[in-house]
C-alpha cells in the first residue's frame, strides 16, 4: 500500500485527501487541485504540488558561478497544467490566454506569447544549483561534515540517490548544493532532482510538505544550520530562448 495504512494519510504529501477506497480497502491518496492519485512512498511531483498549492485556501564561490543560461524562478506561483504522469506540460497558459514554455521544473524558459505559441517538447532541467546563505555561527562549519550532512539529508529525507548530489561547495556563509541528473541517468523509481529541490526549498522556508513531520532541523555535529536566504538556479539540457530585450533589461 502506498499510504500509511493505519490512519490513512500520505507521509510524503500533506496536500492530499486520503480514503480507504483503493483495491481491497487500501488507503489511497489524491492530490488536492488535480485529484490525481499519488504514490505516498516517494515525493509527489512539483507540478501536482503547485496545483494543490494554488487550490488551497489562501491566508490573508570556490563557489559555482551560474552559467549565462541559468534560470531563476522569478515568475512565482501559477496554476500549472500537468500531464497524466504529473509532469509539467511543456506549454503553460494563464486565464487571459497568455502562454509560455516551461522546463521540467515548471520554470518559464521562453518569452510569453499567445495561444499560437508552440512548445515542442518538455526540456529537462539537468542541473540545479541551490545557493544558501547560513546565519552567523561561532565559527565556520567543517566542509567535509557539511557535505556529509547535506548528502544525508537529500538521501534520507528526499530519497534522492547520492549520485545525483554532484557537489557541496562552501565558503562561509555561502553553501552551494549542485544536483545533476541527465535523462539517461534517471532510472524508473528515481526521485527527480527538481522534485527534491522543491521539497528542500519548501522545508527551508518552514513550509514542509511532509505529513506530520516537524520542520527541517538541520545540524552539523550538533550545531544548528540555519538558512537565511535561498536562491535556486536551473540549467536545462537545451538553453532557454528569450529575446534580447529581456536579456538586456
Amino acid at each position: 500500500h502506498t499510504a500509511a495504512q493505519d490512519n490513512c494519510t500520505c507521509p510524503t504529501n500533506k496536500m492530499t485527501v486520503c480514503s480507504p477506497d483503493g483495491p481491497g480497502g487500501r488507503c489511497q491518496c489524491r492530490a488536492l487541485g488535480s485529484g490525481m492519485a499519488v504514490d505516498c512512498s516517494t515525493l509527489t511531483s512539483k507540478c501536482l504540488l503547485l496545483k494543490a498549492r494554488m487550490s488551497a485556501p489562501k491566508n490573508a564561490r570556490t563557489l559555482v558561478r551560474p552559467s549565462e543560461h541559468a534560470l531563476v524562478d522569478n515568475d512565482g506561483l501559477y496554476d500549472p497544467d500537468c500531464d497524466p504522469e504529473g509532469r509539467f506540460k511543456a506549454r503553460q497558459c494563464n486565464q487571459t490566454s497568455v502562454c509560455w514554455c516551461v522546463n521540467s521544473v515548471g520554470v518559464r524558459r521562453t518569452d510569453k506569447g499567445d495561444l499560437s505559441l508552440r512548445c515542442d517538447e518538455l526540456v529537462r532541467t539537468h542541473h540545479i544549483l541551490i545557493d544558501l546563505r547560513h546565519r552567523p555561527t561561532a565559527g565556520a562549519f567543517n566542509h567535509s561534515d557539511l557535505d556529509a550532512e547535506l548528502r544525508r539529508l537529500f538521501r534520507e529525507r528526499y530519497r534522492l540517490h547520492p549520485k545525483f548530489v554532484a557537489a557541496v561547495h562552501y565558503e562561509q556563509p555561502t553553501i552551494q548544493i549542485e544536483l545533476r541528473q541527465n535523462t539517461s541517468q534517471k532510472a524508473a523509481g528515481d526521485v527527480d532532482i527538481g522534485d527534491a529541490a522543491y521539497y528542500f526549498e519548501r522545508d527551508i522556508k518552514g513550509e514542509s510538505l511532509f505529513q506530520g513531520r516537524g520542520g527541517l532541523d538541520l545540524r552539523v555535529r550538533g550545531e544548528p544550520l540555519q538558512v537565511e536566504r535561498t536562491l535556486i538556479y536551473y540549467l536545462d539540457e537545451i538553453p532557454p530562448k528569450f529575446s534580447m530585450k529581456r536579456l538586456t533589461a
Epitope: H143, S144, D145, D147, A148, E156, R157, A167, G214
Partner: antibody, heavy 117, light 111 residues
Amino acid sequence: DVQLQESGPGLVKPSQSLSLTCSVTGYSITSGYYWNWIRQFPGNKLEWMGYISYDGRNNYNPSLKNRISITRDTSENQFFLKLNSVTPEDTATYYCARDTTAYFDYWGQGTTLTVSS
Amino acid sequence: DIVLTQSPPSLAVSLGQRATISCRASESVDSSVNRFMHWYQQKPGQPPKLLIYRASNLESGIPARFSGSGSRTDFTLTINPVEADDVATYYCQQSNEDPYTFGGGTKLEIK
C-alpha cells in the same frame, strides 16, 4: 565522556517481538547526531539496522523495514529497538552506536540475544 | 546495496612488519569532498572501535601506526609497524548510500 549501554532480555521465543534499550550518558540524544542499532551475527558479519536522529527522524535498513521500529524517550535519554516476528536468524549481539557524520564513533558493549523456543 | 569485499580474510604478520588490508566497494563511495569509507578494529568480546574515518582521517587517540588511503572503490588500511596489541579483526564500512554496509572482516594474527 559519551557512553552507551544496551539492555535486553537475552532470550526471545520465535515469532515474538524483541525489545532492547540503549541508555546514553554524557550527551543529550536531542542535541545532535544519529543513534543507531547494529547487530553482529555469530559468524561475525555486521549489519546496520537503522537509526533515530536528534530530531526524531528514522532511517531503517530496507531488509528490516517491515519489522523494525526505533523510538526514544528524551526525558530518560534512551532509545529503543523493537523487532517483530523474530526467528533464530535474528540471534546476534546487538550494539547501539552514535553516528557522528556517517561513521560510528561511540559504541555500547553489546547485548547478546538468542532466539530459541 | 553497496557490497564491501575485504581481502585477505586473514593475515599473519611478523611483529614490526607492515600489515595491509584491502576493501573494495561494488560502486564508488566518494563525493566531491569526501570518501565515505571508515575502518574499525574489533577484539574478542569487545565492540568495534573506530580507527579511521572518511578513508584517511585518524580518529582521536588512535596511534599513528594506523593509516588509511584510497578513493572511489578501492581502499586500504595499513598498520606499520605491527604490534602485539593489534591482533584483532578489522572491518571497513561505507556510508555513502543507504543502507550502510560493512566488509566481512580481516583477522590479523602475529606470525
